[in-house]
C-alpha cells in the first residue's frame, strides 16, 4: 500500500512575490529498499510534477527552472526550493517518492505556500552629504532578495547628471554629480524582479548643500 509520512514544521509557508522559499521535507528514516525511487513534488490535484529528479519526467512549464527538488537521501533531504515566487504558485504541495516499476510509493502530507504582494523596498545609501559639482556614489540595495533568485534589474530615475557605477547581484551604484538646482528633486531606484514580473521602488529627495 501507499505509505504516508508527515512533513515536519508548519502546515503553511509565506513568501513575497519575486522572492524565494524553502519547503522543508525529510525522508522517512525507515525506507525499504524496494520503495526507493525518484522524488516528485506535486501541486495538489495535478498529475505532472512541479519538480523532480527523474530524468525521464517532464515538469510543469510554469515551474520549470524555478522549482527545484533538493535531493540528498544521505541527509534524508527532499526539500523543495522555490525561487522567483509568483502569485500563481499560491497552492498546496506534496512530495512523493516512487519507482515507476512499483505500484506504491511514499507520499507526504500537504503544505500550503501562500504568495503575498511584495512589500519589501530597496534601500538607498548616500555616504555623507551631496555637494554641488562633487561626484558621489549612491547605492541601491535589495539585501532581502535571495541568492538563488533571478538577479533583479535596477533602474534609476533622476534629473541630476548621473552615470552608472558597478553593480552586484543585489545592488547598483549610481554616480551622481548634483547641481544646485537639483536640490529637492526626486531620485528613484526601481528594482524589477523579472522572474516574477514584479517591481518595487524607493524615492528620495535630494538634499544638495
Amino acid at each position: 500500500q501507499e505509505r504516508r509520512f508527515q512533513l515536519e514544521g508548519p502546515e503553511s509557508l509565506t513568501v513575497q512575490e519575486g522572492l524565494c522559499v524553502l519547503v522543508p521535507c525529510r525522508l522517512p528514516t525507515t525506507l525499504p529498499a524496494s520503495y526507493y525511487g525518484y522524488g516528485y513534488w506535486f501541486l495538489e490535484g495535478a498529475d505532472v510534477p512541479v519538480a523532480t529528479n527523474d530524468p525521464d519526467e517532464e515538469v510543469q512549464e510554469e515551474t520549470r527552472g524555478r522549482f527545484h527538488l533538493l535531493w540528498d537521501p544521505r541527509r534524508k533531504n527532499c526539500s523543495l526550493s522555490i525561487r522567483d515566487a509568483r502569485r500563481r504558485d499560491n497552492a498546496a504541495y506534496f512530495f512523493r517518492l516512487k519507482s515507476k516499476w512499483m505500484k506504491y510509493g511514499y507520499t507526504s502530507s500537504k503544505l500550503s505556500v501562500r504568495v503575498m504582494a511584495l512589500t519589501h523596498r530597496p534601500k538607498i545609501l548616500i555616504p555623507g552629504t551631496l555637494e554641488p559639482g562633487h561626484s558621489k556614489n549612491l547605492t541601491c540595495s535589495v539585501s532581502w532578495a535571495c541568492e538563488q533568485g533571478t538577479p533583479p534589474i535596477f533602474s534609476w530615475l533622476s534629473a541630476a547628471p548621473t552615470s552608472l557605477g558597478p553593480r552586484t547581484t543585489h545592488s547598483s551604484v549610481l554616480i551622481i554629480t548634483p547641481r544646485p538646482q537639483d536640490h529637492g528633486t526626486n531620485l528613484t531606484c526601481q528594482v524589477k524582479f523579472a522572474g516574477a514580473g514584479v517591481t518595487t521602488e524607493r524615492t528620495i529627495q535630494l538634499n544638495v548643500t
Epitope: L31, P32, A33, S34, Y35, Y36, G37, Y38, N53, P55, D56, W71, D72, P73, R74, S99, K100, W101, M102, K103, Y104
Partner: antibody, heavy 116, light 107 residues
C-alpha cells in the same frame, strides 16, 4: 518468507527458444517491479530486463533487445522470460529478482546453456 | 548506457582489515547506486542502496558513501564471512548496469 523460484533452464541449441519462469511467494507480487539478471560462467552480473508491477512498462539490455521478452501473470504470481534466437553468449545462470530501482530479493537462479 | 567501473578488480586482505572498494559511473547517477555481495554458487545479496543506506539485516561494518560519479563501499573490520565478490549497480536509468565486480580474497 519471501521466495523466488526460477525454472525452465536447460541445454538448448543456438537459434532455438526457451521460456524461463519465476514463481513468487511471501509478498504481494502484483505491487512489485521484477527483474531478470544473468551471470555467465565465471563472469560478473549482467542486468537483462525489468517489468513494472502491472506489466505496462518494460526495459531491456541492448544485448537482448528484440530477442527476449519479459512478462508477468499477476494472477499466478509468476514472472516469465521468453528467450528467442538464443546465442552461445546467452549461456548463463538467470536470476529472477524483486525490486523497483533497487533489487532487494533474488532467486537462486536457473542455468541456461546454449550449445550445439 | 552508463558504464560502471569498479576498482580494484581483486583484493587480498586479512580478517580485521579495513577495506575500501570504489565504483565510478561514466556520468552522474546522483545517489542511485546499490552494492551487492555474492558468494560462490549463491545469489547476490543487497548490502547498500541509495549509495549509503544500509539494507535491513546487514552488519553495520558495511557502509557506503558518494554521490554523482564516485562511490565507495567500506568494510570497517573484515570478518571471515565477508570474503566474496562485490558488485556496484546504478539504478539511475535503464539499462541498470553493474560494475565488473571486485573479488575480495583472504591474504
Amino acid at each position: 518468507e519471501v521466495q523466488l523460484l526460477e525454472s525452465g533452464g536447460g541445454v538448448v541449441q543456438p537459434g532455438r527458444s526457451l521460456r524461463l519462469s519465476c514463481a513468487a511467494s511471501g509478498f504481494t507480487f502484483s505491487s512489485y517491479g521484477m527483474h531478470w539478471v544473468r551471470q555467465a560462467p565465471g563472469k560478473g552480473l549482467e542486468w537483462v530486463a525489468v517489468i513494472s508491477y502491472d506489466g505496462s512498462n518494460k526495459h531491456y539490455a541492448d544485448s537482448v533487445k528484440g530477442r527476449f521478452t519479459i512478462s508477468r501473470d499477476n494472477s499466478k504470481n509468476t514472472l516469465y522470460l521468453q528467450m528467442n534466437s538464443l546465442r552461445a553468449e546467452d549461456t548463463a545462470v538467470y536470476y529472477c529478482a524483486r525490486g523497483g530501482q533497487t533489487i532487494d530479493i533474488w532467486g537462486q537462479g536457473t542455468m541456461v546453456t546454449v550449445s550445439s | 548506457d552508463i558504464v560502471m567501473t569498479q576498482s580494484p578488480s581483486s583484493l587480498s586482505a586479512s580478517v580485521g582489515d579495513r577495506v575500501t572498494i570504489t565504483c565510478r559511473a561514466s556520468q552522474s547517477i546522483s545517489s542511485y547506486l546499490n552494492w551487492y555481495q555474492q558468494k560462490p554458487g549463491k545469489a547476490p545479496k543487497l548490502l547498500i542502496y541509495a549509495a549509503s543506506s544500509l539494507q535491513s539485516g546487514v552488519p553495520s561494518r558495511f557502509s557506503g558513501s558518494g554521490s554523482g560519479t564516485d562511490f565507495t563501499l567500506t568494510i570497517s573490520s573484515l570478518q571471515p564471512e565477508d570474503f566474496a565478490t562485490y558488485y556496484c549497480q546504478q539504478s539511475y536509468s535503464t539499462p541498470y548496469t553493474f560494475g565488473q565486480g571486485t573479488k575480495l580474497e583472504i591474504k
